[in-house]
Interface confidence: low
C-alpha cells in the first residue's frame, strides 16, 4: 500500500484585501479513508478553517466536489479575504473514527493579505496664525497591510523635511496605521497654498494616495490701512477715504468715527480677491466741514477675524477750510498695524458707499 | 451587535400553517447560518432545522423534514419558518438562533415567538 | 441519532456550594480533535444563552464560576460557587451530527 502524501504546492500565496484565495492541497492516494481538515497555524492553539465532512464556513468552499468519487484535491477557496485570515493555512488528512485520527499533514502555505491604506486625511490648525508662524499638519492613514510605507509631505509641490511619522503598532498585526505630523512655517504669501501628505504602499502599484489641506484654513493675513483725505469737493464736504488692503480672511468689520463717536459700520463682503488670494476694501466718509467749529479727528478702526481691533486716525482741519484742498492737513495712527512691510502692486479695489 | 427580531404571537386551527420570521441586524447575514429551535409549555428545547443564507443549504430534523420549510430573504436579512399541517402539540414558542462559530451551535437567539394551534 | 441524557433532571444546591449536572452522549461527540458538545442556560421566559463551546470554553461574558468538561460520551457542567441568579434550567446540545438537545436540568436553590 503506497503511503499518503499532502501536497500542498505554494510554500506562500499574496492576496488583496476583499479578493479571494485559492489554498491547494491534493492527496496521492485514496487510502486511508477519511477527512480533509483545513487548519489556521499549528499545535493545539490552531484554528479550524474547514472541516471537509462536518460543521459548516460560510466563506469557505471546496474547489472540486470533495464527494465526487476518487476526488483527491482538497482546494479551498476563501472569499472576501481581510488582513485577518493572514497566517499559515495545512490541509491535513485525517482517518475515519470516532474522533477522527490525523494522519498527515501539508507542509503549510502561508498567505499574506495585501490591504490598502485608506485615504489620508489631513488636518490642521483649529486656529489661524500669522505669516512666520509654524503651524502643524497632521495626516492619518488607516487599515494597510504590509507594515512597509511612504509618507511624504508637500507644500506647492516642493517636498518638507520637517515632520515627524509614526507606525502603530509596532508589533505584528493584522493591520497598520500611519500618523505624520509635519510642521510648516506660513508666509504671507500662503493663502492660495496648499499642503500635501503622500503615501506610498506595496497596494497602491505605484500610484500613491494623497491627502490635501488649504493653507487659507490655517493662516491670517492681517490688514494695512492708511487713511488719506481726497481733493476737497463743493459744498464743504472733505472725502476721507480707509484703505484696508492685503486682508485674509475675508471677515472684516470696519467701523468710522467722528471725535470718537461712531458715525457708521461696515462689514466686508463679496469682495474680489487679489491674486494672492487676499482682499483690499476702500471705503470713504464725507465730512462736512461747515457743520463743525474745531477739527475733526476721524478714526478709521478695523476688526479683522475677530482680532483686536486695529485703529488709523486722520485730523480735518476745519480753520484749513474751505481755502485749502487738504495738502497740509495731517494724518495721525493711533493704533498699531500687525504687519510691517509696504503695500504692493496689487491693484486696490475701491467699493464707495 | 448581534440581534434577531422575530415575529410576534399566532394563533392557528389545527391544519393551518404558520410562517414564522427572524429579522438579522449587526453582522453579516449570509455569513453564518440560521437556527430554529422549539420549546414546548414546560418542555425542553427541541431543533427543528437550520439554513445557510448564503446558498439556502438546509438541514432538517427528520421529525419536521415533511412539514417545515425554511427560507431566508438576503435582501432584508430576515430567515423564515413556516410549519404547515398544525396540530395541537405544535403549540410552542418558536426560536430562531444564530450560528456565530459555525460550530452548529447557536450563539445568538431571538424572543420567540409563541404560536399557539387549537380549534 | 446521537441521543443525549442529562442527569439529573431536577437539582436543588446551597448558594456557594458546587453544582455538577451531567449530559452523557449515546456515542461519542468527539471529532477531528474537539468535542462538539454544548451548554445552554434558560432563565424562565427568556431564550436560551450559550455557556460552554465545544465542550470546555466559555462563551464571552460568562462568569468563570462556570466551567465543563468531558470528552468522548461524558461531559459534565460544574458551577464552582451556586449564585442566585444562576437558578435555571440547563441545556446540553451536541452537533457531532446534526444538532439535539439534552432534556433539561432544573437547577434550583436548596
Known amino acids: 500500500e503506497e503511503e499518503l502524501q499532502v501536497i500542498q504546492p505554494e510554500k506562500s500565496v499574496s492576496v488583496a484585501a476583499g479578493d479571494s484565495a485559492t489554498l491547494n492541497c491534493t492527496v496521492t492516494s485514496l487510502i486511508p479513508v477519511g477527512p480533509i481538515q483545513w487548519f489556521r497555524g499549528a499545535g493545539p492553539g490552531r484554528e479550524l478553517i474547514y472541516h471537509q465532512k462536518e460543521g459548516h464556513f460560510p466563506r469557505v468552499t471546496s474547489v472540486s466536489e470533495s464527494t465526487k468519487r476518487n476526488n483527491m484535491d482538497f482546494s479551498i477557496h476563501i472569499s472576501n479575504i481581510t488582513p485577518a485570515d493572514a497566517g499559515t493555512y495545512y490541509c491535513v488528512k485525517f482517518r475515519k473514527g470516532s474522533p477522527d485520527v490525523e494522519v498527515k499533514s501539508g507542509a503549510g502555505t502561508e498567505l499574506s493579505v495585501r490591504a490598502k491604506p485608506s485615504a489620508p486625511v489631513v488636518s490642521g490648525p483649529a486656529v489661524r496664525a500669522t505669516a512666520e508662524h509654524t503651524v502643524s499638519f497632521t495626516c492619518e492613514s488607516h487599515g494597510f497591510s504590509p507594515r512597509d510605507i511612504t509618507l511624504k509631505w508637500f507644500k506647492n509641490g516642493n517636498e518638507l523635511s520637517d515632520f515627524q511619522t509614526n507606525v502603530d503598532p509596532a508589533g505584528k498585526s493584522v493591520s497598520y496605521s500611519i500618523r505624520s505630523t509635519a510642521r510648516v512655517v506660513l508666509t504671507r504669501r500662503d493663502v492660495h497654498s496648499q499642503v500635501i501628505c503622500e503615501v506610498a504602499h506595496v497596494t497602491l502599484q505605484g500610484d500613491p494616495l494623497r491627502g490635501t489641506a488649504n493653507l487659507s484654513e490655517a493662516i491670517r493675513v492681517p490688514p494695512f490701512l492708511e487713511v488719506t483725505q481726497q481733493s476737497m469737493r463743493a459744498d464743504n464736504q472733505v472725502n476721507v477715504t480707509c484703505q484696508v488692503t492685503k486682508f485674509y480672511p475675508q471677515r472684516l468689520q470696519l467701523t468710522w468715527l467722528e471725535n470718537g463717536n461712531v458715525s457708521r459700520t461696515e462689514m466686508a463682503s463679496a469682495l474680489p480677491e487679489n491674486k494672492d488670494g487676499t482682499y483690499n476694501w476702500t471705503s470713504w466718509l464725507l465730512v462736512n466741514v461747515s457743520a463743525h467749529r474745531d477739527d475733526v479727528k476721524l478714526t478709521c478702526q478695523v476688526e479683522h477675524d475677530g482680532q483686536p481691533a486695529v485703529n488709523k486716525s486722520f485730523s480735518v482741519k476745519v480753520s484749513a477750510h474751505p481755502k485749502e484742498q487738504g495738502s497740509n492737513t495731517a494724518a495721525e495712527n493711533t493704533g498699531t498695524n500687525e504687519r510691517d512691510y509696504k503695500d504692493d502692486d496689487d491693484k486696490h479695489h475701491h467699493h464707495h458707499h | 451587535q448581534v440581534q434577531l427580531v422575530q415575529s410576534g404571537a399566532e394563533v392557528k386551527k389545527p391544519g393551518a400553517s404558520v410562517k414564522v420570521s427572524c429579522k438579522a441586524s449587526?453582522?453579516?447575514?449570509?455569513?453564518?447560518?440560521i437556527n430554529w429551535v422549539r420549546q414546548a409549555p414546560g418542555q425542553g428545547l427541541e431543533w427543528i432545522a437550520m439554513?445557510?443564507?448564503?446558498?439556502?443549504?438546509?438541514h432538517y430534523n427528520q421529525i419536521f423534514k415533511d412539514r417545515a420549510t425554511l427560507t431566508t430573504d438576503t435582501s432584508t436579512s430576515t430567515a423564515y419558518m413556516e410549519l404547515r399541517s398544525l396540530r395541537s402539540d405544535d403549540t410552542a414558542v418558536y426560536y430562531c438562533?444564530?450560528?456565530?462559530?459555525?460550530?452548529?451551535?447557536?450563539?445568538?437567539w431571538g424572543r420567540g415567538t409563541l404560536v399557539t394551534v387549537s380549534s | 441519532d446521537i441521543v443525549l441524557t442529562q442527569s439529573p433532571d431536577s437539582l436543588a444546591v446551597s448558594l456557594g456550594e458546587r453544582a455538577t449536572i451531567n449530559c452523557r452522549a449515546s456515542k461519542s461527540v468527539g471529532s477531528s480533535g474537539y468535542n462538539w458538545l454544548f451548554w445552554y442556560q434558560q432563565k424562565p421566559g427568556q431564550p436560551p444563552k450559550l455557556l460552554i463551546y465545544?465542550?470546555?470554553n466559555r462563551d464571552s461574558g460568562v462568569p468563570d464560576r462556570f466551567s465543563g468538561s468531558g470528552s468522548g460520551t461524558d461531559f459534565t457542567l460544574t458551577i464552582s460557587s451556586l449564585q442566585a441568579e444562576d437558578v435555571a434550567v440547563y441545556y446540553c446540545?451536541?452537533?457531532?451530527?446534526?444538532?439535539?438537545f439534552g432534556q433539561g436540568t432544573k437547577l434550583e436553590i436548596k
Open positions: 465545544l465542550a470546555s
Open positions: 439554513i445557510d443564507p448564503s446558498d439556502s443549504e438546509t
Open positions: 438562533a444564530m450560528d456565530y462559530g459555525s460550530l452548529y451551535a447557536m450563539d445568538y
Open positions: 446540545q451536541h452537533s457531532r451530527e446534526l444538532p439535539t
Open positions: 449587526g453582522y453579516t447575514f449570509t455569513n453564518y447560518w
